[in-house]
């Protein structure tokens, strides 16, 4: 009787979760005389294991970040000890959980700007990195301003891109910071994983300082 | 301990057939293959079959049997579980098959001849 | 089939002298598939070697085993009278299993 975990060697891919500890077998491959044993060789990191009747499984929790596709070979071998079918390729791809936090890559940040400068324009980028897959929304990073200080009349003088880190003026930093008035501020930049959408996403903090430098350009006179 | 216990000489005649015996002990006989070999007088030696004595019946068994191809319709393996021996069977006797045959068991550990019967003196004469 | 060269066929060596036995194989195999065997006239073969370099249970430690690839030998340190047999080399890679012609080897 084949099914969903037995059958004849063929070439497959299975998809396992990591972190999870076994709790079942990952496929029963069936023997055909003259074979009467199986042979697991390739990147098994001494996680995955064939018993002699066909049984593949694992021994302990897979790790995406150590190694996100196990390709294996599985063959079939005789009484002897001689491949009689196989080797045939098994691939095990480890799908990501979110097991890794977001880290900043500086835990403080110096940057400078001159006053009037382009709304938008970034002039300092902050980078954080996470292990998980960027593909899915484990490793998709969130940036945000958490604090400016000084904040005066609560307004924000600066904004972040959300998705790159990048730090610009806002229409109203541009059009009103003085190095004269305020010649430095601080902002705490918080990171998120998940998109930033999740109560279950990591997060990091950095702080950045900026200095506010004199627009020397002077329009000319008429 | 492990013997391999080979049946006596045989003189007999050509086109005639003649079965060999090795009734093994000291371990459990379908564990490991038997394997059959071949010496002819001041020659080498010559790997002729195997055979895997899984299960007691003849059909089954035969799934688990393995023939250098020079020997194959020349020999014929065959095993008792009940009786732990296995048999090779030589037919269509020539001058040629005139030699000394050995059977030997397959250690599934590094996979060698680890042990080997005392050998059957086969003559083929008229 | 896999071709099993031995060389030399025969070969006479005095009491104490070092004695190396070639086995030249016809297609590479793995270390572990190479296995020598000693026979003394009017008996069976005895493992003596296998995986190309394990002594058989009750080998002397004289013996040695080396090789890989297409290319293995047998030494023997030191001869002595016992020794003087013929020794064979066999493969366990591919059906058919092949052995090579042998080694007669005599004491001077």
């Known amino acids: 009787q084949e099914g969903k975990f037995s059958g004849p060697l063929k070439p497959m891919t299975f998809s396992i979760y990591e972190g999870q500890e076994p709790s079942q077998i990952i496929f029963q491959f069936k023997a055909n005389p003259p074979a009467v044993t199986f042979e697991l060789t390739g990147e098994t990191d001494n996680i995955f294991v064939i018993e002699r009747e066909g049984l593949l499984y694992y021994n302990r929790a897979l790790d995406r970040e150590t190694r996100s596709t196990h390709n294996l070979q599985v063959a079939a071998l005789d009484a002897n000890g001689i491949i009689v079918e196989g080797p045939v390729p098994i691939t095990i791809k480890v799908k990501d959980i979110n097991d890794n936090r977001p880290t900043f890559l500086q835990s403080k940040y110096e940057g400078s700007v001159r006053q009037n400068s382009r709304p938008g324009k970034p002039f300092l980028y902050v980078n954080a990195t996470d292990l998980d897959d960027p593909a899915t929304p484990n490793g998709q990073l969130y940036y945000q301003i958490v604090i400016q200080l000084p904040m005066i009349n609560n307004v924000m003088y600066f904004q972040i891109n959300n998705k790159t880190g990048a730090i610009s003026l806002t229409r109203e930093g541009s059009q009103e910071l003085n190095p004269a008035k305020n010649p430095s501020y601080n902002l705490v930049i918080s990171v998120k994983d998940m998109g930033g959408q999740s109560e279950n996403s990591f997060s990091d903090t950095t702080s950045v300082d900026i200095i506010v430098t004199e627009n020397i350009w002077k329009a000319p006179k008429p | 301990q492990v013997q391999l216990q080979q049946s006596g000489a045989e003189l007999v005649k050509p086109g005639a057939s003649v079965k060999i015996s090795c009734k093994v002990s000291?371990?459990?006989?379908?564990?490991?293959?038997i394997h059959w070999m071949k010496q002819r007088p001041e020659q080498g030696l010559e790997w002729i079959a195997y055979i895997y004595p899984r299960d007691g019946s003849t059909n089954y068994s035969e799934k688990f049997t393995g023939y250098n191809e020079k020997f194959k319709g020349k020999a014929t393996l065959t095993a008792d579980t009940s009786s732990s021996t296995a048999y090779m069977q030589l037919n269509s006797l020539t001058s040629e098959d005139s030699a000394v045959y050995f059977c030997?068991?397959?250690?599934?550990?590094?996979?060698?001849?680890?042990?080997w019967g005392q050998g059957t003196t086969l003559t083929v004469s008229s | 089939d896999i071709v099993m060269t031995q060389s030399p066929t025969l070969m006479a060596a005095s009491p104490g002298e070092r004695v190396t036995i070639t086995c030249s194989v016809s297609?590479?195999?793995?270390?572990?598939?190479l296995h020598w065997y000693q026979q003394k006239s009017g008996t069976s073969p005895k493992p003596w070697i296998y995986?190309?370099?394990n002594l058989a249970s009750g080998v002397p430690v004289r013996f040695s085993g080396s090789g890989s690839g297409t290319s293995y030998s047998l030494t023997i340190s030191s001869m002595e009278a016992e020794d003087a047999a013929t020794y064979y080399c066999q493969q366990w890679s591919s059906y058919p299993f092949t052995f090579g012609s042998g080694t007669k080897l005599e004491i001077k």
């Open positions: 030997a068991r397959g250690y599934r550990g590094f996979f060698y001849f680890d042990y």
């Open positions: 995986g190309t370099s």
């Open positions: 297609s590479s195999i793995r270390s572990s598939n």
């Open positions: 000291g371990y459990t006989f379908t564990d490991h293959t």
